[in-house]
């Protein structure tokens, strides 16, 4: 329930004045913040009208005003000069007009004694759809049908009935003739411009005699939505642009200088490289809406954004447009990790994934951002279990270290390993980050072997060799499932002679099973961690036979085989191959309430960066 | 001196209707608020709605949330009556209904008895089965 209050209905008439009272709780964040009056459209936006930090619409330019009363905790908006086409539905609030606290309040003005007047006010946004009625009478119902616009002082021919159409309005007018009953016709101007706007007239007949309306148009230009996000973040754009506009191209354009828009993303497939892999294209809904996520959030992202629909899939006169000015805080809540990770062919990498530590409970998701069409994000790992098929022993998603941070791994590496993977959760939205691994010349650090058989009954020891540079690491051996990777007994067997010039402080530490059984098949991993902060991981997968003849096995570097490519699922696994990030659990609206993130206090271990914010494979 | 008399309510059924109406006498000005209040048995009294106008014909409505959808308010023009319709009620609508009156206009907080000089005796609204 929103601690804003005001009058619900308010009713006035033609050219009288209005004050609208909103009562807020007077904290001094309340006190200060800002006060706005916006409009609440059709499709659900709210287009701000007058706010406290000096924004005046121009449809309010000269007869509107808001006063905040800090000390008695009010604002006031008088507003003069009414007319009908104030009625309508707005909100008086505090903050963020989508985000912030509010009141509805809907404002009906009614036409005043002496006020008739012949012109009839349309008020259209840009790139939308104006509708004329234009009444005639009977004797006039098999004359000629126009429209003009007054153009100066002279009256310029727009369509008319017998097929003219002006050049201005080619392929975006029509007149509409309605059935012998009713004495009206229409013209439909599609794709407004912001030119259409002003005085038209329109005529049944061409002699004393004919009926004339007059029309004034009004085109606005969308007021843009002022978003707040974190540096790092992440940002959503829900662009609602009608089902008029269902089948045309979509794009979101970020502007420049003058009235450039450059293109950020379309659904004719261009991606501007600065967004690359870090933007995605939500398919459109039936009444043509779609959403653009925006991840990895820079300063330099920071700007006025709009989004639009033309066959083009740019910006271009007539385009219906939704309009953004997104501000990047710097003073981000979200803590830096690196944004570039490498790894070597045949190594592991682990990722530190940020959420938000308020919501320690929600799922944790990884998933592989892909650029073909307009961007997806198919799931690959999630903190339930599952996993999706391909990664089967090779990927982990672990809830440590936790406390605002967790920890996804991958190993056995290989170059179509390359690209830009999302971390996110069910919870919050703006907390889903991008990093990108990199594949780089060199060698796995850890060695084993690779596939490996163990005999029904019998022992098996399989060895793994850490270099010196792990000297101070906690040593692991796992066995690895959908849920993690379960710590096994390991033990140290001394120094290693896997590595040259290495000395006395490398390692082999073996992982034994006693009397194999059929459960012990499967991946194992080794790998190094500092605490509850994960390095690098090394994976061997261990297939069970029947005995052939008695004894242990003792695995070494020399007689190990390749890891098999393909692995037979288990019957129970849970595979869901188009589990992807347009999963509609993971676009949860934002919740239109007062943003109150606490700033993230750097209990998590922090990654030198350094200015690229990368991070090696091998260095954790 | 204004004089404020309430009218109009009784027993009434779950998901039933009442309208109740206040008269003011006396004193008038151009500008008022007048609003309903309510007092359950044992509990502090409550704003329910109200409706300010100016002299030049401009009204402001104000429900709380409660009662937002279910309960109208409305003035005659002819003279100086407010009425509060009453549809959809609920047991926990049970109450002596008070109205109230303020030359204050539309510069204060009309939630608050505060801001009300003018009060009437009540009008008991029971909705039971």
């Known amino acids: 329930k929103s601690p804003i209050f005001g009058p619900e209905e308010v009713n006035s008439v033609e050219g009288n004045s209005v004050s609208i009272t909103c009562y807020y709780p007077p904290t001094s964040v309340n006190r200060h913040t800002r006060k706005y009056w916006c409009r609440q459209g059709a499709r659900g936006g709210c287009i701000t009208l007058i706010s406290s930090e000096g924004y005046v619409s121009s449809k309010y330019a000269g007869r509107a005003n808001l006063t905040n009363f800090p000390e008695n905790g009010t604002f006031v908006v008088n507003i003069a000069q009414l007319s009908q086409d104030d009625s309508g539905r707005y909100k008086c609030g505090l903050g963020i007009n989508s985000r912030g606290l509010s009141f509805d309040v809907s404002l009906e003005v009614s036409q005043g004694p002496g006020l008739l007047n012949d012109t009839k006010v349309y008020t259209v946004d840009l790139g939308r759809t104006v509708t004329i009625n234009c009444p005639f009478k009977t004797e006039n119902a098999q004359k000629r049908k126009s429209l003009y616009k007054q153009i100066g002082l002279y009256p310029v021919l727009v369509i008319d009935s017998s097929g003219y159409v002006n050049p201005n309005y080619t392929g975006r007018i029509r007149l509409d003739i309605q059935g012998t009953g009713q004495l009206l016709f229409s013209v439909v101007i599609n794709q407004l411009r912001l030119s259409d706007a002003g005085q038209y007239l329109c005529q049944a007949g061409d002699d004393s005699n004919s009926n004339k309306k007059n029309a004034d148009l009004q085109v606005l230009k969308p007021e843009p939505e002022l978003v707040y996000e974190d540096l790092r973040g992440s940002v959503t754009f829900h662009c609602a642009l009608g089902p008029e506009v269902a089948n045309v191209a979509k794009f979101l354009c970020r502007q420049s200088s003058g009235e450039n828009c450059d293109v950020v993303v379309n659904t004719l497939g261009k991606r501007a490289p600065a967004f690359e892999g870090r933007i995605l294209l939500n398919p459109q809904d039936k009444d043509g809406s779609f959403s653009v996520v925006i991840t990895g959030l820079r300063k330099e992202d920071a700007g006025r954004y709009l989004c639009g629909a033309h066959s083009d899939g740019q910006l271009q006169e007539g385009s219906p447009i939704q309009a953004w000015q997104l501000f990047v805080n710097e003073e981000s809540t979200i803590p830096r990790s690196p944004t570039v990770v490498k790894g070597v062919a045949g190594g592991s990498v682990a990722v530190l994934c940020p959420y938000n530590r308020k919501e320690s409970k929600s799922i944790k998701y990884w998933c592989l951002w892909e650029g073909a069409q307009n961007g997806r994000c198919p799931l690959l790992v999630d903190s339930e279990g599952w996993v999706k098929a391909q990664y089967e022993g090779r990927l982990s998603l672990l809830e440590e270290p936790g406390n605002g941070t967790f920890t996804v791994i991958l190993n056995q590496l290989t170059s179509r390993d390359a690209g830009f993977y999302w971390c996110l959760t069910n919870g919050d939205t703006l907390w889903r980050t991008t990093v990108e691994i990199k594949i780089i010349e060199g060698e796995p650090n850890l060695k084993v072997p690779g596939n490996v058989t163990a005999v029904l009954g019998e022992t098996l020891k399989v060895p793994c060799h850490f270099p010196c540079k792990f000297s101070s690491y906690e040593k692991y051996w796992c066995k690895w499932n959908n849920t993690g990777c379960q710590a096994l007994p390991s033990q140290d067997e001394g120094p290693s002679k896997a590595f040259v010039n290495c000395d006395e402080n490398s390692r082999l530490v073996s992982l034994t099973l006693n009397l194999v059984t059929r459960a012990d098949e499967g991946w194992y991993w080794c790998g190094v961690k500092q605490g509850h902060f994960y390095g690098e991981t090394a994976a061997v997968y261990v297939a069970v036979e029947e005995r052939k003849a008695a004894g242990s096995r003792d695995v070494s570097l020399a007689k190990a085989d390749a890891a098999p490519d393909e692995k037979v699922l288990d019957s129970g696994f849970r595979e869901i191959e188009n589990k992807a990030i347009q999963d509609p659990r993971l676009f949860a609206e934002e919740k239109a309430v007062a943003d109150t993130r606490d700033q993230a206090d750097g209990s998590r271990a922090s990654v030198d960066s350094g200015s690229s914010e990368e991070q090696g494979g091998s260095s954790r | 001196e204004v004089q404020l008399v309430e009218s109009g309510g009784g027993l009434v059924q779950p998901g039933g209707s009442l309208r109740l109406s206040c008269a003011a006498s006396g004193r008038t000005f151009s500008s008022y608020t007048m609003g309903w209040f309510r007092q359950a048995p044992g509990e502090e009294r409550e704003f329910v709605s109200a409706i300010s106008w100016s002299s030049d014909g401009t009204y402001y409505k104000y429900y709380t949330d409660t009662v937002k959808g279910r309960f109208t308010i409305s003035r005659d023009n002819a003279e100086t009556t407010v009425h509060l319709q009453m549809n959809s009620l609920k047991p926990e609508d049970t109450a002596v209904y008070y109205c109230?009156?303020?030359?204050?206009?539309?510069?204060?907080?009309?939630?608050?008895?505060?801001?009300?000089?003018?009060w009437g005796q009540g009008t008991l609204v029971t909705v039971s089965s």
């Open positions: 109230a009156a303020s030359s204050s206009g539309t510069y204060g907080d009309p939630r608050s008895e505060r801001e009300y000089r003018y």
